[in-house]
Amino acid sequence: LADPLDHRDAGDLWFPGESESFEDAHVEHSISRSLLEGEIPFPPTS
C-alpha cells in the first residue's frame, strides 16, 4: 500500500505563539516509520 501521508516539514508550520497551526508529523519521523521492512507499530493509514 502506498503511504498517503506526505512528508512535509512540520517545523515550517509552527511559529512561537501560533502553535494552533502545528502539524503532528511524529508518525512520519518515528522509529517505526524508519524501519523499511517488517511489521511496524505505525502502519500506513488508509
Partner: antibody, heavy 114, light 112 residues
Amino acid sequence: EVQLVESGGGLVQPGGSLKLSCATSGFPFSNVWMHWVRQASGKGLEWIAHIKAKSDNYATYYAESVKGRFTISRDDSKTTIYLQMNSLKTEDTAVYYCTGLDYWGQGTTVTVSS
Amino acid sequence: DTVMTQSPLSLPVTPGEPASISCRSSKSLLGVRDITSLYWYLQKPGQSPQLLIYRMSNLASGVPDRFSGSGSGTDFTLKISRVEAEDVGVYYCAQFLRYPYTFGPGTKVEIK
C-alpha cells in the same frame, strides 16, 4: 531489534549537573525525532524535551520546567541522544526515558538530594 | 498549555467485561491534514510505557484488537471490548500537537 538504552543517571546534589545518554540501535536513526520524558516516583509522565532531525536543523523544544537548565542533543554518527542537565533541583528527581513516542527505553533514575 | 484530563482516575474491572476510559483536552487536537494528535499508552507495573493507539484511532502494531480509540477534537475514549488480566496498569492519553506536549494524569486499571 530496536533498542533504546539510557544511562548516566545517579545521585547528585542540588545545583549539580548530570549528562544522560540514550544509545539506540536496530533502526535508521538520522531521520527520527527523539524525546525525553520523565516520571517522578508514583507520578505521571512529563514530556521535557524534543529534538528533530538534521533535515529540520536539529530544532529543539523544551518544557518550561527545564528550559534554560537542560539541553537535548544528538550524535547521528553514534545514533545516540543526550540530555545535559544543569542546576538540578530536588523536583528533577525522576526516571528519565528516551523515546521516539512509539518505542521507549527502560529508563534511568536521577536522584537530586543533599 | 493544552491540559489533558482523564476519567475515571481509578477503574476496577472484571475480566471478560468491557471497560472504557475518557480523555479530554482543553484545546482541539485536530491539526492539518485532518489528523487528530491523540495517543494512548499503557504502563504496566514496573515497565516503560507502551503505545496502544496513535492519532486517536489507529491501533499500534502488536496491540490486541480488543483495544480501540475514538473521539472528536477534544473528547476521546479508549475502549477495551473484553478486559484480560494482562491489561492492568496505568493508561495515559497524550497530545503531540502543541508545545509543550502533555500527558493526562493517568487511569489506574486494576482487577476487581
